[in-house]
């Protein structure tokens, strides 16, 4: 039996409007039927939680309200949209993702997705 | 700082009962999953499981299901373990331990000793 | 359950010296392997994670390696206060751990 594997993409461009969106897919051992996907975001060596939602297989993803993701998933594969982003914010953002149900319960790490933030350069006023 | 208190020693009768705490400090507490460890003397570490304090989910070692109740009190930041019908097979250091985000085991309380004698 | 083997019950060395600790997986476990130190009458303390990353604070002559199914913790120096059981431990599935190596003084 081989751990579970996770894939992510390695680099990720934000949108002019701070929207970056991701794929992150898993190689299930066995027939999940509830699983928890949750971004992290590591800088230096510090890790947070950026938002985490678990979902039933064949179910849309619940994060919390004031969640700055959403994601919808696909067999194995869940995408990810995280928005509200500034340039600050770039960073590694690693998926984790949890077998919750039923036993046995599997862990799988992604390796991390590079996002890239640039806020937008404020318009010139114009004279009309 | 992270820091998790456990409920001091407790001598408890065979066939009893015992609720023993864990009361977490230093960080948001509904983040991470909190997990309990049995060490009985002179003996490794026995996984008995975890609860992730946001939604009250566990994940248990089949061997306790039956054996340990798991439950939090998010307002407080505790983290409860009862343990029920004990035997002397019970006595042993109880620890909670947060689980970090990428898997480990990152901090522990002190421990409670339960001992189970007549 | 995926098992964790720590053949070595016990280890003897010197202050100075240089002591490997290994520890092996009964399946493939990538690098999900913590290592903790335990000292008498206190609670474990984690040492090293994903197979080779050290904690907050860990003195950088604890260094781990390894991936798959073997995996080794290496003390470089060995200071007195290094003197404990030292477990390993795997996260891949639901948790278990290797039943310790006690290091101590030759």
């Known amino acids: 039996c081989k751990a579970m594997h996770v894939a992510q993409p390695a680099v990720v461009l934000a949108s002019s409007r701070g929207i970056a969106s991701f794929v992150c897919e898993y190689a299930s051992p066995g027939k999940a039927t509830e699983v928890r996907v949750t971004v992290l975001r590591q800088a230096d060596s510090q890790v947070t939680e950026v938002c985490a939602a678990t979902y039933m297989m064949g179910n849309e993803l619940t994060f919390l309200d004031d969640s700055i993701c959403t994601g919808t998933s696909s067999g194995n594969q869940v995408n990810l949209t995280i928005q509200g982003l500034r340039a600050m914010d770039t960073g590694l953002y690693i998926c984790k993702v949890e077998l919750m149900y039923p036993p046995p319960y599997y862990l799988g790490i992604g390796n991390g997705t590079q996002i890239y933030v640039i806020d937008p350069e404020p318009c010139p006023d114009s004279d009309f | 700082q992270v820091q998790l208190q456990q409920s001091g020693p407790e001598l408890v009768r065979p066939g009893a009962s015992v609720k023993l705490s864990c009361k977490a400090s230093?960080?948001?507490?509904?983040?991470?999953?909190i997990n309990w460890v049995k060490q009985r003397p002179g003996q490794g570490l026995e996984w008995i499981g975890w609860i992730y304090p946001r939604d009250g989910s566990i994940i248990f070692n089949e061997k306790f299901k039956g054996k340990a109740t798991l439950t939090v009190d998010t307002t407080s930041s505790t983290a409860y373990m009862e343990l029920h019908s004990l035997t002397s097979e019970d006595s042993a250091v109880y620890f909670c331990a947060r689980r970090g985000l990428l898997g480990p085991l990152d901090y522990w309380g002190q421990g409670t000793p339960l001992t189970v004698s007549s | 359950d995926i098992v964790m083997t720590q053949s070595h019950k016990f280890m003897s060395t010197s202050v100075g010296d240089r002591v490997s600790i290994t520890c092996k997986a009964s399946?493939?476990?990538?690098?999900?392997v913590a290592w903790y130190q335990q000292k008498p009458g206190q609670s474990p303390k984690l040492v090293i994670y994903w197979a080779s990353t050290r904690h907050t604070g860990v003195p950088d002559r604890f260094t781990g390696s390894g991936s798959g199914t073997d995996f080794t913790l290496t003390i470089s120096n060995v200071q007195s206060e290094d003197l404990a059981d030292y477990f390993c431990?795997?996260?891949?599935?639901?948790?278990?751990f290797g039943v310790g190596t006690k290091l101590e003084l030759k």
């Open positions: 431990q795997q996260y891949s599935s639901y948790p278990t």
């Open positions: 230093g960080y948001t507490f509904t983040t991470y999953d």
């Open positions: 399946q493939d476990v990538a690098t999900t």
